[in-house]
């Protein structure tokens, strides 16, 4: 194929791939008609003047995962047709000025995972057609004003995983076409008002894993097209009342892993497209009425691993579409009987790892579609008569690790559990805590006559019999309902995630804890 170097493979489609540790310089001669050239995993340490001079038809050039630390300014001369250039995963510390001069067709420039210490306005001043610029995974400490001023067509800019401590409010001002801006995993402590004002077409803004403490009230007010906003794993302690007020297109918002202490009513919204809200790992202590009332389409609300001790009866007003509610690992001792009344479509509720000592009899009264209830690891001694009777779709109920009091008052619950054993699962059953002479015995098979009789003997001898429903999938063939949505934290599609399996009260629904927001 017009001559293919021995250390490369060349395909009929004008694609050349050169790989291997034995390669220490750009192989020659390269086929003059090559349109795609990949130089991967070699020991090339530098690019000299014009190594690609005879392949002017080249459209895509990938020089990745090499030992490349030095590039001569004229290395890419004569590549006027080049649209895609990747120098990712090398050892570049410095970019020579003028390196990209003459690359008039360049649309994608990938410089990620190098050791770049700085960028200057002159670096990209010739790249007026650039649409994508990847600079993540370098050692950048600041971005000078004007660095991106000539990139007016840029739609995607990734500055994640650097060492940025501050951002100038002017640095993005000319990027009116930008759709994706990623600043995750830096050291940003605050973002000046006006920083994002020019980004009127922005759809995704990734700010997770920084050290942001405060958000300016109008920080996102010009970003009406924003769909995905990642603010997780920062130090945000409060949300200004209007900060999310003008984000009607938002469909993903992550705020987990911050220091939020309270949420004021109406803070979220209106956001008619928001389907999931992740607020776990904060310091929220209470939920006031109507705090989520603008989120009419919300389906998943994760409030686990906070310090919530009080939920106002109207806290979940408006959440008529909610399917999953996670409140586990909080400090709840009591729940108002009406707190879940508006959640007509709720399927999964996790209340484990709280301090609940009793539940109102009507707590699940209007939530007829519940399929999974997690109540393990609370301080429940008994449950009200008939609390689960109307839950025909219930197929997972976790009641273990509670101090069940096995006197005669427990009989109605015991009888109901006996008839509905499959719903409890087979791994861990609830056991009696008191009286001491029956401690540790299964609540389901306990002989209550052995226990100390209660002073109060209920008039109704047992729960109404609700064994199995025709519309309920047989157990255990069905996959546990609560192990669907909340198995992983929200994962962005652009970050390599390290997942850590957590199995105690620090997990989120028994979530794997993803590092990205």
């Amino acid at each position: 194929y017009h001559g293919c170097p021995s250390e490369c493979t060349c395909s009929r489609a004008s694609q050349v791939e050169c790989t291997g540790a034995r390669i220490v310089a750009v192989p020659t001669p390269l086929p003059w008609n090559a349109m795609s050239l990949q130089i991967l995993n070699t020991h090339i340490t530098e690019l000299n003047e014009s190594p690609f001079l005879n392949i002017s038809a080249l459209i895509a050039l990938r020089i990745e995962k090499n030992e490349l630390s030095r590039i001569t300014p004229g290395a890419f001369r004569n590549l006027g047709s080049l649209r895609y250039l990747s120098l990712a995963n090398n050892k570049l510390q410095v970019l020579p000025i003028g390196l990209f001069q003459g690359l008039d067709s360049l649309e994608s420039l990938l410089l990620s995972s190098n050791q770049l210490l700085q960028i200057q306005p002159a670096h990209f001043s010739q790249c007026s057609n650039l649409k994508e610029l990847q600079l993540h995974g370098n050692h950048l400490e600041y971005i000078p004003d004007g660095a991106f001023d000539h990139l007016v067509g840029l739609t995607k800019l990734n500055l994640g995983k650097n060492s940025l401590t501050h951002i100038s409010p002017r640095v993005f001002q000319h990027l009116g076409n930008l759709q994706v801006l990623r600043l995750y995993e830096n050291r940003l402590t605050d973002i000046p008002m006006g920083t994002f004002d020019g980004l009127v077409n922005l759809q995704e803004l990734a700010l997770q894993q920084n050290q942001i403490g405060l958000l300016s009230p109008g920080l996102f007010h010009n970003n009406h097209n924003l769909q995905r906003l990642y603010l997780s794993n920062n130090h945000i302690s409060q949300l200004p009342p209007s900060v999310f007020m003008q984000l009607p297109q938002l469909n993903r918002l992550t705020l987990f892993g911050n220091s939020l202490k309270e949420l004021s009513p109406g803070i979220f919204g209106p956001m008619p497209n928001l389907r999931e809200l992740w607020l776990y790992d904060n310091h929220i202590s209470s939920l006031p009425d109507n705090v989520f009332s603008n989120l009419r389409q919300l389906q998943v609300l994760i409030l686990s691993r906070n310090q919530i001790s009080f939920i106002s009866p109207g806290a979940f007003n408006g959440l008529t579409e909610l399917r999953e509610l996670s409140l586990h690992t909080n400090a709840l001792q009591d729940l108002d009987g009406n707190v879940f009344r508006m959640l007509a479509n709720l399927q999964n509720i996790s209340l484990q790892n709280n301090r609940l000592r009793q539940l109102p009899g009507n707590i699940f009264a209007n939530v007829n579609g519940l399929m999974a209830i997690q109540l393990q690891n609370n301080q429940l001694e008994n449950l009200p008569l008939g609390i689960f009777d109307h839950l025909g779709k219930l197929c997972e109920l976790r009641l273990y690790d509670n101090p069940w009091r096995c006197d005669s008052d427990i009989l109605p619950l015991r009888n109901w559990l006996l008839l509905n054993q499959p719903r409890l699962g087979t791994d861990t059953v609830p056991v009696c805590f008191s009286p001491a002479n029956v401690r540790g015995q299964s609540l389901i098979i306990i002989n209550v006559n052995v226990a100390v009789p209660s002073v109060h003997v209920p008039e109704v001898p047992s729960y109404p019999e609700t064994p199995w429903y025709p519309d309920t999938p047989s157990y255990p063939d069905t996959t546990s309902v609560s192990s669907t949505t909340e198995l992983t934290s929200p994962v962005e599609d652009y970050t390599d995630l390290t997942t850590i399996q957590v199995t105690d009260d620090r997990s989120v629904w028994g979530m794997t804890q993803a590092q990205s927001g």
Epitope: R355, R357, D401, V431, D504, D505
Partner: antibody, heavy 120, light 112 residues
């Protein structure tokens, strides 16, 4: 007879980790919870966490990121794993359970403790 | 976290006399529905492991002598030893379990 016996203490380097064991007899771990409590010399008691009969765990919030409590029911053993140790973790470490008390978080049977010293 | 503050730090009482130890919590330990105060008292003698004396603020653990009594509600609690015996020399700790347990700093009781 109910017994709890701690082991695994000793000298640990700062920044290192420890894994303490609590071997129980006279009762089953599938029926009773086991707590871990520590006490620095001449100081007060500090609750570290608990693993309940069904395997759920609760932790002291100040230490949660460094602690893991686990158990093997068949071996009648409970474990305390603690990472990133510092001098302030030097203490006697006890395991305890609620054998007859009506108090769910009460601890009426204790081991004799195992001493952990964090020093270089 | 709930902070438990004990007073006094130490107490010297003659044999047969009354000893009173106070414990104050940073928030109420009373659950209005169960009507229980989630406070316990422990005794720790020199060189020994702690021993549970009283739970729910005033319920004596099985086998504990009736000279030990607990009282109080909400945030203020008291352990009283009505007639101090030589074997009562120890450090006494209060502990809340309204939230995840925290202990008071301890009160050392000695014979005068």
């Amino acid at each position: 007879e109910v017994q709890l016996v701690e082991s695994g203490g000793g000298l640990v380097q700062p920044g290192g980790s420890l894994r303490l064991s609590c071997a129980v007899s006279g009762f089953s771990l599938t029926s009773y919870g086991v707590h871990w409590v520590r006490q620095a010399t001449g100081k007060g008691l500090e609750w570290l966490g608990v693993i309940w009969a069904g395997g759920s765990t609760n932790y002291n919030s100040a230490l949660m990121s460094r602690l893991t409590i686990s158990k093997e029911n068949a071996k009648s053993s409970v474990y305390l794993q603690m990472n990133s140790l510092r001098a302030g973790d030097t203490a006697m470490y006890y395991c305890a359970t609620h054998m007859i008390t009506e108090d769910y978080y009460g601890m009426d049977y204790w081991g004799q403790g195992t001493t952990v010293t964090v020093s270089s | 976290d709930i902070v438990m503050t004990q007073s006094p730090d130490s107490l010297a009482v003659s044999l047969g006399e009354r000893a009173t130890i106070n414990c104050k919590s940073s928030q109420s330990l009373l659950n209005s529905r169960t009507r229980k105060n989630y406070l316990a008292w422990y005794q720790q003698k020199p060189g020994q492991s702690p021993k549970l004396l009283i739970y729910w603020a005033s319920t004596r653990e099985s086998g504990v002598p009736d000279r030990f009594s607990g009282s109080g509600s909400g945030t203020d609690f008291t352990l009283t030893i009505s007639s101090l015996q030589a074997e009562d020399v120890a450090v006494y700790y209060c502990k809340q379990s309204y939230n995840h347990p925290t202990f008071g700093g301890g009160t050392k009781v000695e014979i005068k």
